[in-house]
């Protein structure tokens, strides 16, 4: 008895394509070693037509492939475009030659069948609606019309021009004719399911003078779309149901034993497996959608379905879609960190890591919002201003070629929990998905900047300091000053006459940044933080006001900022996520499953781009050492 | 959820031949693997033959006991699967049952328990 197992006999029609699935023992050799498929010759040679290590037959070529799913412990053999030569004994097995474990294999390809010469074949899929159209002469125009399905020798009738119909197609089918046409009929079957697949026959008159038309209706489940992804990275289901249900609820769902489970639909219904990691997208007013699922788990792998109905649930007889996701566990995108936590007040340092062969793409941050379908708006981007009511608190760090950028979120408030994406215009598969957990402060933040109504008067030197514990002794100190596009890490050498030095007092654990003279310009927020190498660590935030020196002028109090760094008012807060930034990028990532539209907001973000070069301190007077 | 009614079985001589017949009815089986199983008294029961379709193009998957004496198909206007067994052997005698579950997976395994029809005995006797 072969370890190997699979369909023993396989049959399918010209023009189709069959997927063979073959089941080998869970060992890792069998794993690992080369899987193929062969044809069986009469003189008892098999030869190889495909196999994983790459070899593809001539007759093969552009319509077969092969397919190792090691976790699963099978491999699939997807063929296409069949034909009747393709009629034959196969083998699917394992081994470095034909003669290992295999399983042999019938396929039959037969030609599409044929009936009767006056038969009209409809082809239709599950939950489409199909129009028969039946001609009689005028004799009959006056007759009773009617249409029935052949169940072997009877015939048993749909509907009929009396107004019956078969319980089984109530509300399904309707008999009707046009304008004023005397010598045709239709009948329209709406819902389709798989049972109304067979011969009908339409029928004019009674008797011998009854006019006769066959109908051979075929109704074809959706054959599922083969989806082969990384563990960890995305896949979108592109669903497009028809104008017909264009005004439907419209829902995804995961096969399950004879259910299929939602996981989101336009009603707000989403399954909690997939929180943070799923958008729901209406792409025009043609009932067309797609689902973006990031993050992708082992558990992901399965039949997925789309459709649409009023109850946003899966019902019988209404078009669906379907797709079967493969998730291999072997992939190239990188095991990340998927819960973050922060405290209060604190700051936390995200690594995004993505294509490291796509080092020049966008980079960008977005927060995942549950509302309705999901949506993610934007953040921050390499190239996309800083969200309003993120200012001063929001930075991404691009590290060319290390494959990975650091998003620093500080000022953390209870508000900031949730989920995060990192994503790129480049390559779609490596969006990961972050959970930000932040906590109530139990205890004084690590990094704290003296003074902390930090006033600088235009022409005076102006020092502040940022106080570490020792814990951060070894790693690099830094100070920069935070713009729209990041944070611009201050120059480590003298800046002549105006005398800009960071110094750090080992004793005291203290880094500070002086500016000297200060100028209009140094307004703004600062941040001082540690890192070692291009991995970034805590950071602190603190807004620096400047006045100008004349008695009595009004200056801006910047305690309100600092204010916000520490308490973050719900009401601000709140106030600030609804105001409309007019200059912000449009950068919304409920485009994001068609991957122009993202490749557009980045045209735009660069339109919208403040100036100021990213890394660069140029213009600025403050220093570091 | 699918309910199955099997019919066919019966006493039949060593050589003999029968038809069992499997029909569904609740919801319809075309996204099914439809599987015939088979228990002898004190035994676990055990795969003998399954069903699969995908538009037209149908998957038969046998035991190895089974190939070049059982046949499966599949009438779908009827909703109903056949097993058509030939060469009968004493060995063959058992309940054989029908079951159905999603086209996921080894069609010989993980047949959940409410998917199951009551089952029809054959007996075959020397």
């Known amino acids: 008895q072969s370890p190997i197992f699979g369909p023993q006999d396989v049959s399918s029609i010209e023009g189709n394509s069959v997927s063979i699935t073959c089941y080998y023992p869970d060992t890792s050799v069998n794993r690992h070693t080369r899987k193929y498929w062969c044809r069986q010759g009469a003189n008892g040679y098999c030869a190889t037509l495909i196999s994983s290590n790459g070899y593809l037959s001539k007759e093969y070529s552009g319509r077969a492939s092969l397919i190792n799913f090691p976790e699963n412990s099978t491999f699939v053999i997807n063929i296409a475009h069949l034909t009747q030569e393709d009629t034959g004994s196969y083998k699917c097995g394992l081994g470095t030659t034909n003669r290992g474990l295999f399983f042999d294999v019938s396929l039959e390809v037969s030609q599409v069948p044929e009936f009767p010469n006056d038969t009209h074949v409809y082809t239709k899929d599950i939950g489409r609606t199909v129009t028969i159209e039946c001609r009689f002469k005028e004799g009959n125009a006056h007759s009773k019309k009617s249409l029935c399905k052949k169940r072997g020798e009877a015939c048993e009738v749909v509907i009929d021009s009396t107004e019956y119909v078969d319980p089984s197609y109530k509300d399904r089918a309707i008999l009707f004719m046009k304008g004023t046409s005397r010598d045709i009929f239709y009948v329209n079957i709406s819902h389709l399911i798989p049972s109304d697949a067979g011969l009908y026959v339409c029928q004019a008159g009674e008797g011998p003078s009854a006019d006769k038309n066959n109908a051979d209706l075929q109704v074809l489940e959706p054959e599922p779309e083969l989806l082969y992804k990384d563990l960890r990275s995305s896949v979108t289901f592109e669903c497009d149901l028809g104008r017909e249900v264009a005004n439907d609820a419209k829902y995804l769902c995961r096969k399950n034993k004879e259910t299929c489970d939602v996981i989101i639909n336009t009603l707000g219904k989403r399954d909690p497996a997939f929180e943070g990691r799923i958008l729901l997208t209406p792409r025009d007013d043609n009932g067309r959608f797609s689902v973006l699922i990031t993050g992708l788990r082992k558990e992901d792998a399965g039949h997925y379905q789309c459709g649409a109905h009023s109850s946003g649930l899966p019902q019988e007889g209404w078009p669906v879609q379907a797709w079967q996701l493969f998730v291999n566990e072997e992939s190239t995108i990188p095991n990340s960190r998927s819960v973050v936590k922060g405290v209060t007040g604190g700051s936390v340092a995200i690594v995004c890591p993505y294509n490291p062969k796509e080092s020049s793409s966008l980079k960008y941050w977005c927060h995942w919002e549950a509302d309705e379908n999901g949506r993610c708006p934007v953040l921050v981007g390499t190239q996309a201003l800083v969200q309003e009511g993120y200012e001063g608190r929001l930075a991404l760090f691009d590290q060319p070629g290390s494959g990975a950028y650091t998003v620093i979120l500080n000022q953390l408030t209870t508000q900031d929990s949730g989920f995060y994406w990192c994503l790129t215009d480049g390559d779609s598969r490596w969006r990961t998905t972050i959970e930000l957990q932040v906590a109530e402060a139990t205890k004084k933040p690590d990094l704290e900047v003296t003074p902390q109504n930090a006033t600088a008067v235009i022409g005076e030197t102006f020092t502040i300091s940022c106080h570490y514990p020792c814990k951060f002794y070894s790693q690099e100190k830094y100070w920069c000053k935070w713009s729209n596009d990041g944070c611009h890490i201050l120059p480590s050498h003298d800046e002549g006459a105006r005398q800009s030095s960071v110094s750090c007092d080992q004793s005291s654990q203290i880094v500070s940044m002086t500016l000297n003279p200060v100028k209009k310009e140094d307004e703004g927020w600062y941040w001082c933080g540690v890192k070692e190498g291009q991995v970034y660590g805590e950071t602190t935030a603190i807004y620096v006001a400047v006045e100008e020196r004349t008695r009595g002028s009004p200056h801006i109090n910047p305690t309100d900022a600092n204010a916000r760094a520490k308490d973050a008012p719900e009401e601000e807060a709140m106030e600030s996520s609804v105001r409309e930034d007019e200059n912000k990028a449009n950068l919304d990532p409920r485009l994001f499953a068609d991957e122009r539209e993202i490749q557009n907001a980045g045209d735009q973000a660069q339109e919208n781009r403040a100036s100021g070069n990213a890394g660069s301190a140029g213009g600025q007077s403050g220093s570091s050492k | 959820q699918v309910q199955l009614v099997e019919s066919g079985g019966g006493w039949v001589q060593t050589g003999g031949s029968l038809r069992l017949s499997c029909a569904a009815s609740?919801?319809?089986?075309?996204?099914?693997?439809m599987g015939w199983f088979r228990q002898t008294p004190g035994k676990e029961r055990e795969f003998v033959a399954a069903i699969s379709w995908v538009g037209s193009s149908t998957y038969k998957y046998y035991t190895d006991s089974a190939k070049g004496r059982f046949t499966i198909s599949r009438d779908n206007a009827k909703n109903t699967v056949y097993l058509q067994m030939n060469s009968l052997k004493p060995e063959d005698t058992a309940v054989y049952y029908c079951?159905?579950?999603?086209?996921?997976?080894?069609?010989?395994?993980?047949?959940?328990?409410?998917?199951w029809g009551q089952g029809t005995q054959v007996t075959v006797s020397s």
């Open positions: 079951a159905a579950r999603p086209r996921v997976g080894d069609p010989r395994s993980r047949y959940d328990d409410d998917n």
């Open positions: 609740g919801r319809t089986v075309s996204s099914y693997y």
